[in-house]
Amino acid sequence: STGAGSHCQKTSLRVNFEDIGWNSWIIAPKEYEAYECKGGCFFPLADDVTPTKHAIVQTLVHLKFPTKVGKACCVPTKLSPISILYKDDMGVPTLKYHYEGMSVAECGCR
Amino acid sequence: STGAGSHCQKTSLRVNFEDIGWNSWIIAPKEYEAYECKGGCFFPLADDVTPTKHAIVQTLVHLKFPTKVGKACCVPTKLSPISILYKDDMGVPTLKYHYEGMSVAECGCR
């Protein structure tokens, strides 16, 4: 996501499964830390936002034609799993240790 | 990058190496098709934007708390190489068939 003046970084985002309607099949946890990628991808792109060549090119083009081309975007570049207790196809409480791609591990400019 | 009302998609972006100051070391091509990912990541996220679970979660949270949490972002999810003729460290024109990560192959919501 883009953010006003701050640099692309990982910020807290507590997600309650009831808020998103997933409590119908996820029994536990009730909420979890998803994190969110927030902030801008400003020139020059620092190493910590692990920019791709395309992101660097787009940033340079945006610098020259800001109204024509957008900035690169601050997004999750690495995700982590969480453990969940969910209802299987038969409704039986079942444990999945690694429910992949649910929490941000790293953010970057893409 | 985000876009007004349109759905996340790959759009044309012709990049002239002179515009970004890379003509000092890239001899050819003079310009290339970099493409750009443009458009919004709106609910519900379609399969063609290959959303991660985190992107789906963030989209649902944004739906409930639009001022607190941003939408997922439309970014390159797969990049392609281009071929370039460049000046090596000694200024000798050298061909690189696969200069990786320069052109968007696919866009998605992240």
Epitope: A28, V92, T94, L95 | -
Partner: antibody, heavy 126, light 111 residues
């Protein structure tokens, strides 16, 4: 080889509470759900409830809701079943049984109670 | 009264074949797996059949399970004296969100 060892027999007065323990050895405790099933003298098996220690999430048969509390201590691989407001009809053998909850195990086996504890006789008498 | 219905007793002579039935509904047997437990006199129940028709290691192939619609059955062939026990069927009830058992069937081996 997983083994479940339960605490000894108890004699209780009506209106009191009883707490039965079930200690697991072998296997990974966080992979289990521990369920409690009782059997009144000469009667069949009756499921009371179960707990998934990994999250501490318990669920109960409606008949026992509010009167039974199932807990677990992961550090000692022990599950507990506490039944309050005891009456003479609660006289029974109480069994704990393991169910594998990890979805890395085939669903057919994941829903089985295996193994069982040796049972704990709880007698409610004035 | 048990949610799953079993005959209270069955009997057979050594070497014979007996079957024990277990009747339920669409929310338990009809939509879920069936399990069978053997309880020898004075001992805890032991898993005999899991997932309708699978035998855990150590259970003789004389024991077999089957399921059709909202009913299940346990078949024992070549009856032996040591098979004398109580047998319970069991399934998850999707609607009630509970594990349900049959009332149990006492198997007597004659002679």
């Amino acid at each position: 080889q997983v083994q479940l060892v339960q605490s000894g027999a108890e004699v209780k007065k009506p209106g009191s509470s009883v707490k039965v323990s079930c200690k697991a050895s072998g296997g990974t405790f966080s992979d289990y759900a521990i369920h409690w099933v009782r059997q009144a003298p000469g009667q069949g098996l009756e499921w009371m409830g179960g707990i998934i220690p990994f999250f501490g999430t318990a669920y109960y048969a409606q008949k026992f809701q509010g009167r039974v509390t199932i807990t677990a201590d992961e550090s000692t691989s022990t599950a507990y079943m506490e039944l309050s407001s005891l009456r003479s009809e609660d006289t029974a053998v109480y069994y704990c049984a393991r169910r594998i909850v990890s979805d890395s195990v085939a669903v057919q086996y994941r829903h089985a109670f295996d193994p069982w504890g040796q049972g704990t006789l709880v007698t409610v008498s004035s | 009264q048990s949610v799953l219905t079993q005959p209270p007793s069955v009997s057979g002579a050594p070497g014979q074949r007996v079957t024990i039935s277990c009747s339920g509904s669409s929310s338990n047997i009809g939509s879920n797996y069936v399990y069978w437990y053997q309880q020898l006199p004075g001992t805890a129940p032991k898993l005999l059949i899991y997932g309708n028709n699978n035998r855990p290691s150590g259970v003789p192939d004389r024991f077999s399970g089957s399921k059709s619609g909202t009913s299940a059955s346990l078949a024992i062939t070549g009856l032996q004296a040591e098979d004398e026990a109580d047998y319970y069927c069991n399934a998850w009830d999707t609607k009630a969100y509970v594990w349900v058992f049959g009332g149990g069937t006492k198997l007597t081996v004659l002679g």
